[in-house]
């Protein structure tokens, strides 16, 4: 004969535990029915009646099988330096990321808690490593041979045209200048690894190589470049 | 209020190890880089470690090199200096200063009051 | 490494004169050079950045120039507060080395 199937609320065997979707209630000590995501116990059960769910209210969500009184607040609106990446529903929290141009300085469970700008390395410097949707932007010295001009997260060192006469010399800020009106270069200038120029030298010497380079942040100074505004909360 | 507050100095001998720590508080700890500078008993400074906002890019002096980890942790808003094999020369006042933002503002700009290293036997 | 040759070493000079510090680099550094001013007992502050701009809050009189390697701090009209030791750092590649120091004592 089949095993008898047994409805909740019902009293458990000795030693074994409720099945799947249920919970055990301390005070009716009974296996009780769970109530669905986006969904909250609106009664608890009794020995002879199982738990009453009701949906979750706006702006409330669960979002696991449960027995809560109450459903969870979702968290407040995205703040300006992020973008909803999931919207509340009454079975998942809002998520916020950080807009593009940031990064996530301080994460939370889901989410982010603290954006920051992405560092814009400033002209001899170009980007050793490009900031992630959790990291920011890593900047080198350009080395010899090499430059940058600009003030960019994205923008790395690029090798200086290779001239028949120079007219000057390139230096990590400033591309070398040819008399010629014919430069040549050898690769494309975006390239990342490249030979080094033959022609023309950096007027500064090699940096020493930087130890294991990784995503850093934003910094809001009291004085100085204005490098981007601290970041902002997303709670 | 910008505030970075060393401790963990002390006496040790050479050859032992001591462990530095800077409580930070009044800016948003995890955007920042930050390093560890020293000042010699004869008022030379020298850089000793930097450690970038994510605490994944670390850079050292050479004479410290091997010996010195520098590392954080967001969560507590600390930094932290683990210094092993300790010499004579380590001998010196080390602060925990805020900075260089590397490759986009390199200055340091604040520096905490300094907790005193001495390694003598 | 970039060695920072820092000048004079020390210099006493009375309240309202004008002194320049000097910085020389062994090689280009790119303005990437801030100077910190250390009173006895404190720590070290913040002056200048990038060679030339003053940090907030620091007097119009202080001011930095820079022509190639050689870098200056000038202080006109010295004030009782301007006294203690000066320093030049760079900031290319590591590491980051820092000037001697110039000790202004006053006369």
């Known amino acids: 004969l089949p095993a008898q199937v047994a409805f909740t609320p019902y009293a458990p065997e000795p030693g074994s535990t409720c099945r799947l979707r249920e919970y055990y209630d301390q005070t009716a000590q009974m296996c009780c029915s769970k109530c669905s995501p986006g969904q909250h116990a609106k009664v608890f059960c009794t020995k002879t009646s199982d738990t009453v769910c009701d949906s979750c209210e706006d702006s409330t969500y669960t979002q696991l099988w449960n027995w809560v009184p109450e459903c969870l607040s979702c968290g407040s609106r995205c703040s300006s330096d992020q973008v909803e990446t999931q919207a509340c529903t009454r079975e998942q929290n809002r998520i916020c990321t950080c807009r593009p141009g940031w990064y996530c300085a301080l994460s939370k469970q889901e989410g982010c808690r603290l954006c920051a700008p992405l560092r814009k390395c400033r002209p001899g410097f170009g980007v050793a490593r490009p900031g992630t949707e959790t990291s920011d932007v890593v900047c080198k010295p350009c080395a010899p041979g090499t430059f940058s001009n600009t003030t960019s997260s994205t923008d790395i060192c690029r090798p200086h045209q290779i001239c028949n006469v120079v007219a000057i010399p390139g230096n990590a800020s400033m591309d070398a200048v040819c008399t010629s009106t014919s430069p040549t270069r050898s690769m494309a200038p975006g390239a990342v690894h490249l030979p080094q120029p033959v022609s023309t030298r950096s007027q500064h010497t090699q940096p020493t190589p930087e130890p294991s380079t990784a995503p850093s942040t934003s910094f809001l100074l009291p004085m100085g470049p204005s490098p981007p505004a601290e970041g902002s909360t997303g709670d | 209020e910008v505030q970075l507050q060393e401790s963990g100095g002390g006496l040790v001998q050479p050859g032992g190890s001591l462990n530095l720590s800077c409580a930070a508080s009044g800016f948003a700890f995890s955007t920042y880089d930050l390093s560890w500078v020293r000042q010699t008993p004869e008022k030379r400074l020298e850089w000793v470690a930097y450690i970038n906002n994510g605490g994944i890019s670390t850079y050292y002096s050479d004479t410290v090199k091997g010996r010195f980890t520098i590392s954080r942790d967001n969560a507590k808003n600390t930094l932290y200096l683990q210094m092993s094999s300790l010499k004579s020369e380590d001998t010196a006042m080390y602060y925990c200063?805020?900075?260089?933002?590397?490759?986009?503002?390199?200055?340091?700009?604040?520096w905490g009051q300094g907790t005193t290293v001495t390694v003598s036997s | 490494e970039i060695v920072m040759t820092q000048s004079p070493a020390s210099l006493s000079l009375s309240v309202g004169e004008t002194v320049t510090i000097t910085c020389r680099t062994s090689e280009s550094i790119y303005s990437n050079l801030p100077w910190y001013q250390q009173k006895q007992g404190k720590s070290p502050q913040l002056l200048v950045y990038?060679?030339?701009k003053l940090a907030e809050g620091v007097p119009s009189r202080f001011s930095g120039s820079e022509s190639g390697t050689q870098y200056s701090l000038k202080i006109n009209s010295l004030q009782s507060e301007d006294f203690g030791t000066y320093y030049c750092?760079?900031?290319?590649?590591?590491?980051?080395?820092f000037g001697g120091g110039t000790k202004l004592e006053i006369k």
């Open positions: 750092q760079h900031f290319w590649v590591t590491p980051w080395t």
């Open positions: 990038d060679a030339t």
């Open positions: 200063v805020r900075g260089p933002f590397y490759g986009s503002a390199n200055y340091f700009d604040y």
